[in-house]
Every structure is written in structure tokens, then in C-alpha cells.
């Protein structure tokens, strides 16, 4: 499973297009900042097997896929651009599928795992209530845009757990 | 280590034209803003505008719209200030700092050293 | 634009006093404020951001609170490199603004 490359080359498409998105300037958009508390320190705290890496990957993903596949999402984006980057996750998805049924067999701390799938979930119910709060207005979309690229950049702890081997 | 390095002092006369620079090292330079702000002879910090990167997308202060204007190359990580008619006023401290765009993150955590600028006939 | 209004301009105190230095906006700016200390001939360095949240590596004597317009910077215990000059700046909306500064000086 040669996850480490095709994630990377993915993920670099991925924020690439993420980039893009934007239709407004960021810099009317300062006063509508958030604090969505991203689990940071829980991961960078922590050395990750291959599977757990995989699964927390996977969730991350699998949310911001849900996320810019709303029907707000869809109003709030330019349509060709949003769909080559949810293209672009479902492919990401499906690498990781992949190699977890390549990793079966693998022993790993489900419940330990769970926790980190929880923080994930409630970091993007955050994100979705913020956007409700502010009924998805276009700075509120442009300040979720920046925090998601700040998240997959943030995930290099758990990249350095694919590289691992179990 | 984060590091926005400037360029040197400069003395110039009125009426030149000037591009100072600050080059950013130890991060994602297109992650953040890079803003700059003046400081003149025993006075303030004045904010003059900012500047995201990744696609150059500027916004000044009305003070400052019109007089000065700010560029970057990403490919090499800098960000520049430039005057094409410089004034005796112009005489100050210039600063670069980093800024983290609308992410919940510290604004201006990282400044650079300072470019003086002199304007004498 | 929003203005930032600080107050006092400058104080003189001593080693181990408690400092205080007030900034006041124009307009509400819920949290968004930022405190920078500058010494002669240096680049200003961030002691606190959005209000209340200490700088990594700031000491633990600076705090930060206030809320809308009003704003403090306390210092609970002043040290001798703690003699600066000190700037609130509004980070709520462009263009960007900061005080005018509050000069703390060795009685």
C-alpha cells in the first residue's frame, strides 16, 4: 500500500483547489474569524500506528467531503472547481479504504482510536454550526475555506504515521 | 525557525523610487499575510496594508492607498514595499510582519528586523 | 476606521508594581485586540492576542482581558526588562489600527 506518495500528491491537489475556491477577498472578511478549536494538541501529542493514522485520515476527509457536498456548499462555490475537489477527496477515500482492508490483521487500541475519530467529529460540528449561525454567508464559507486548508496542514503527524511500519 | 529577514537600510533622495523587501523562511509563506506597518522618528506603529501571497491580493490603509504599493514572489518567498516617487515624509522604520488571514491564530507573531529608510536632500 | 484610544501615554513605576495600561475602540471589536511591547530600536513582539490569550513564550505576569471597546493590559509583578513602550492594536477589520502607545518608564 504506497499510501504515503499518492496521499501527499492528492492532498497537495486537494488544497490546491481548496485555494482556489475563494470568490471573495479574505480581507472583508476579518470580523467573521472563529476559534473552531482544531484537536491539535491530541494529535500532535501523539504517535500513530499505520491503521490508526488511516482511520483518523479517513474521518477528516470523509467530513470535509460531507461538508462541501451540502446544498449550501454547492451555492457558495464556483460549481467546476467544487467538483474536481470532491472528486478529488472521494479519490483520497478511496486510497485509504483501500489500504485499510490491505492492513487488516493489524493489531491497534480501538477505543483509544475512537477518541481521536470523536474530537474530529466534533471539530466539524463547529465548523457546521458556525456556518448555520451565520447562515452561510460568503465570509463565513471564506473563513471555513482557510480552516480546512489549516487543518490538512495540520494532519502531519498523521501522515508520519502512514510512513510507519506497524 | 520562522524568520522574516529586510533588507538594509537605505538613504535616498526626493523623488527616487525605492522597493524594500522581506523575505520569510521556516513556514508555509503562501499560509500567511504579510502586512506592513511604519514607524516614524519617535512616534507610533502605523499599519500600511497587507498582502496575501498566494494569489497577491493587497488591501492598504487610506493613508496609504495611492503611495506606496505591495507586491510579493511567492517562488521566493518575499514581499515587497515599493515607493516610485519618494517624499522627505517617507523618512521612517519600516516593518514586516506575519499574519495568519482568517485563521484563529496570533496576528503578527513574527516581525522582521526593520528597514530603515531615509529621505534627505 | 476605528480608533484606538490608550491610556495613560506614560507611567513611571517601580520594580514589582502592579501595571495597568487601558485601550478603548471607537466601535465594538468583540475580542479581536492584540498587545505588542516595543524597546528602543526593536521590532515590536506580540504579548497577547485576541484580548486574553498569552503569546507562546510571553511571561506569565502579562494578562490581557476586556471585551466590545474597553480593554486592559495588566502586569502583575514589573521586572526590569519589562520598561517599554506598549500598543494595543484592533484586529477586527481593515483598516488595521493601533494605539498610540503607553511608554513605561523606572520611577
Known amino acids: 500500500c504506497d499510501l504515503p506518495q499518492t496521499h501527499s500528491l492528492r492532498n497537495r491537489r486537494a488544497l490546491i483547489l481548496l485555494a482556489q475556491m475563494g470568490r471573495i477577498s479574505p480581507f472583508s472578511c476579518l470580523k467573521d474569524r472563529h476559534e473552531f478549536r482544531f484537536p491539535e494538541e491530541e494529535f500532535d501529542g501523539h504517535q500513530f500506528q499505520k491503521t490508526q493514522a488511516i482511520s483518523v485520515l479517513h474521518e477528516m476527509i470523509q467530513q470535509t467531503f460531507n461538508l462541501f457536498s451540502t446544498e449550501d456548499s454547492s451555492a457558495a462555490w464556483e460549481q467546476s472547481l467544487l467538483e474536481k475537489f470532491s472528486t478529488e477527496l472521494y479519490q483520497q477515500l478511496n486510497d485509504l479504504e483501500a489500504c485499510v482492508i490491505q492492513e487488516v490483521g493489524v493489531e491497534e487500541t480501538p477505543l483509544m482510536n475512537e477518541d481521536f475519530i470523536l474530537a474530529v467529529r466534533k471539530y466539524f460540528q463547529r465548523i457546521t454550526l458556525y456556518l448555520m449561525e451565520k447562515k452561510y454567508s460568503p465570509c463565513a464559507w471564506e473563513v471555513v475555506r482557510a480552516e480546512i486548508m489549516r487543518s490538512f496542514s495540520f494532519s502531519t503527524n498523521l501522515k508520519k504515521g502512514l510512513r510507519r511500519k506497524d | 525557525e520562522v524568520q522574516l529577514v529586510q533588507s538594509g537600510a537605505e538613504v535616498k533622495k526626493p523623488g527616487e523610487s525605492l522597493k524594500i523587501s522581506c523575505k520569510g523562511s521556516g513556514y508555509s509563506f503562501t499560509s500567511y499575510w504579510i502586512g506592513w506597518v511604519r514607524q516614524m522618528p519617535g512616534k507610533g506603529l502605523e499599519w500600511m496594508g497587507i498582502i496575501d501571497p498566494s494569489d497577491s491580493d493587497t488591501a492598504y490603509s487610506p493613508s496609504f492607498q495611492g503611495q506606496v504599493t505591495i507586491s510579493a514572489d511567492k517562488s521566493i518567498s518575499t514581499a515587497y514595499l515599493q515607493w516610485s516617487s519618494l517624499k522627505a515624509s517617507d523618512t521612517a522604520m519600516y516593518y514586516c510582519a506575519r499574519h495568519p488571514g482568517l485563521n484563529w491564530a496570533p496576528d503578527f507573531d513574527y516581525w522582521g528586523q526593520g528597514t530603515l529608510v531615509t529621505v534627505s536632500s | 476606521d476605528i480608533q484606538m484610544t490608550q491610556s495613560p501615554s506614560s507611567l513611571s513605576a517601580s520594580v514589582g508594581d502592579r501595571v495597568t495600561i487601558t485601550c478603548r475602540a471607537s466601535q465594538s471589536i468583540d475580542g479581536a485586540l492584540n498587545w505588542y511591547q516595543q524597546k528602543p530600536g526593536k521590532a515590536p513582539k506580540l504579548l497577547i492576542y485576541f484580548a486574553s490569550s498569552l503569546q507562546s513564550g510571553v511571561p506569565s505576569r502579562f494578562s490581557g482581558s476586556g471585551s466590545g471597546t474597553d480593554f486592559t493590559l495588566t502586569i502583575s509583578s514589573l521586572q526590569p526588562e519589562d520598561f517599554a513602550t506598549y500598543y494595543c492594536?484592533?484586529?477586527?477589520?481593515?483598516?488595521?489600527?493601533f494605539g498610540q502607545g503607553t511608554k513605561v518608564e523606572i520611577k
Open positions: 492594536q484592533q484586529a477586527y477589520d481593515f483598516p488595521l489600527t
